[in-house]
């Protein structure tokens, strides 16, 4: 027989030879990191037909790391389903808890013993320090010193000393989240007031108000014979300016050779279409179709 078979978990006892006589026996032992559990044979014999009798390494089992219990308020998950060396043990914490230590342990061989690569981690309760205090405002539970996971506070603005109220800019409700941090930055309380939006040759059609505070929304339309240059809808933003800017109403061109500018993509269509004679491929009529429009 030629050289005997090799195995992942078993190795030959003694030095291998290039050739073996019929009836000659070779013995195996489990490799380092494996241990033997009977009854499977760990030897083979060179048979009369010059082949080795069947043998397998299935009696050699990997060394195992000790079982680790789930951490309190968490879970230990075996990545490949067994505790044999080479295994990975992943740790996760329940919602509201965070991990202290390594989130993965590896089952490793030290000499002939399988041991874990470190100490199992702990799951600690997520706690937050009080959220920031804000100028011209306050938050609920201001007397609480420690907040637990998902505990929420709501901010509100104080009454303003002047005629215009404080607006709350940002998230009014924030909660204690992962990493013991608050879900959002604290909001801001300040007076936000936009100027009265004046549009020549047009007018406001919605969002009427005494004054225009934070997030006030106004819509416009142009007079007949004028088209909107800009957006028909504007919003009062936190820096007390309109966004997009207040639009303009421009006169629709009556010249058959000059093309009227079009309104922005976000805005509405012109309130009166420019004459078709402005476009290539159309014949130019003798009389401009807009000549009799009221101003």
């Amino acid at each position: 027989c030629e050289a005997p078979p090799t195995f992942e978990a078993m190795e030959l006892i003694g030095k291998p030879k290039p050739y073996y006589r019929v009836g000659e026996r070779v013995d195996y032992k489990c490799k380092k990191g494996y241990f033997y559990i009977p009854p499977l044979a760990t030897h083979t014999i060179c048979d009369r037909n010059h082949t080795w009798l069947p043998v397998s390494d299935e009696g050699c089992y990997r060394e195992m790391c000790p079982h680790i219990r789930d951490p309190l308020n968490g879970e230990a998950i075996l990545a490949n389903g067994s505790y044999e060396f080479g295994a990975e043990l992943h740790f996760i914490c329940n919602e509201g808890y965070y991990l202290i230590g390594k989130d993965i342990l590896y089952c490793e061989l030290k000499d002939t013993v399988a041991i874990w690569s470190g100490k199992p981690p702990l799951c600690e309760k997520i706690l937050c320090t009080p959220p920031p205090k804000i100028k011209n405002g306050k938050h609920t539970f201001s007397e609480v010193e420690v907040f637990e996971y998902l505990d929420a506070v709501t901010y509100s603005c104080d009454p303003a000393p002047g005629p215009d109220p404080f607006s709350l800019i940002g998230e009014s409700m924030i909660y204690c989240g992962n990493n013991s941090t608050w879900s959002h930055a604290a909001p801001e309380c300040k007076v936000v007031k936009c100027r009265f939006p004046v549009v020549e040759n047009g007018k406001q059609i919605s969002g009427f108000g005494k004054k225009f505070y934070y997030k006030a929304t106004v819509m416009f339309e142009c007079d007949k014979g004028y088209y909107l240059n800009g957006s028909d809808k504007i919003v009062c933003e936190s820096n007390s300016t309109w966004d997009p800017p207040v639009p303009k109403c421009l006169k629709v061109s009556t010249s058959p050779t000059t093309k009227s500018p079009t309104s922005s993509a976000s805005g509405p269509r012109p309130t009166y279409k420019p004459p078709v004679s402005n476009y290539p491929g159309y014949p130019k009529p003798d009389e401009g179709i807009l000549n009799n429009l009221d101003d």
Partner: antibody
């Protein structure tokens, strides 16, 4: 509190020109939106136009071709330039501080009289 | 331009009377209407803005109401110092325009 004082009124012949001034004291003219309004017995109160803090202007289209509003920040003064004056332009002319960016006329000057007559 | 028509053009009231002045717009102006009083020999002064909001320092015997095209200024108990000409003004659309005025006298 800013005070606005109009000046430059007087007698002018038809077809003539006149420049009215609106001087601000106790504040900067560039910090306020300034409107010009006139009043006559025959035509009542008429809004002429406004110059905004950013220097932009809006006019009453009835006067746009003849009247121009401007501002000189170094002199802390707003102006109303009136050309091609007609007899019907005879009126008391007021400059007025628009209330906080809103078209509410809360702070009127004492007015200056313009008489257009031959 | 939007026209504002005031009525009556003049009225005479006794001290303590309730006075009502109306202002009608030629088209809808939402609540974008102000009221002014011009006392004899003085410049106009703002009384009410945005239909019903009292300007600072204005006595609460003055009140405004209305919406759209029809607006009212009421003086609950007129006083001698309330004499003068009352004007309405719209600001929904340029040019901003005034009513022709209502003259209030005390009997």
């Amino acid at each position: 509190e800013v005070q606005l004082v109009e000046s430059g009124g007087g007698l002018v012949q038809p077809g003539g020109s006149l420049r009215l001034s609106c001087a601000a004291s106790g504040g900067s003219v560039s910090s306020y939106d300034i409107s010009w309004i006139r009043q006559s017995p025959s035509r009542g109160l008429e809004w002429l136009g406004v110059i905004w803090t950013d220097g932009g202007t809006n006019y009453n289209s009835a006067f746009m071709s003849r009247f121009t509003i401007s501002r000189d920040d170094s002199k802390n003064t707003a102006y109303l330039q009136m050309n091609s004056l007609k007899t019907e332009d005879t009126a008391v002319y007021y400059c007025e501080r628009v209330y906080d960016g809103y078209p509410w006329f809360a702070y009127w000057g004492q007015g200056t009289l313009v008489t257009v007559s031959s | 331009a939007i026209q504002l028509t005031q009525s009556p053009s003049s009225l005479s009231a006794s001290v303590g009377d309730r006075v009502t002045i109306t202002c009608r717009a030629s088209q809808g102006i939402s609540n974008y209407l102000n009221w002014y009083l011009q006392k004899p020999g003085q410049s106009p002064q703002l009384l009410i803005y945005y239909t019903s909001s009292l300007f600072s320092g204005v006595p609460d015997r003055f009140s405004g109401s209305g919406s759209g095209t029809d607006f009212t200024l009421k003086i609950s108990r007129v006083e001698a110092e309330d004499v003068g000409v009352y004007y309405c003004q719209q600001y929904i659309k340029l040019p901003w325009t005034f009513g022709q005025g209502t003259k209030v006298e005390i009997k």
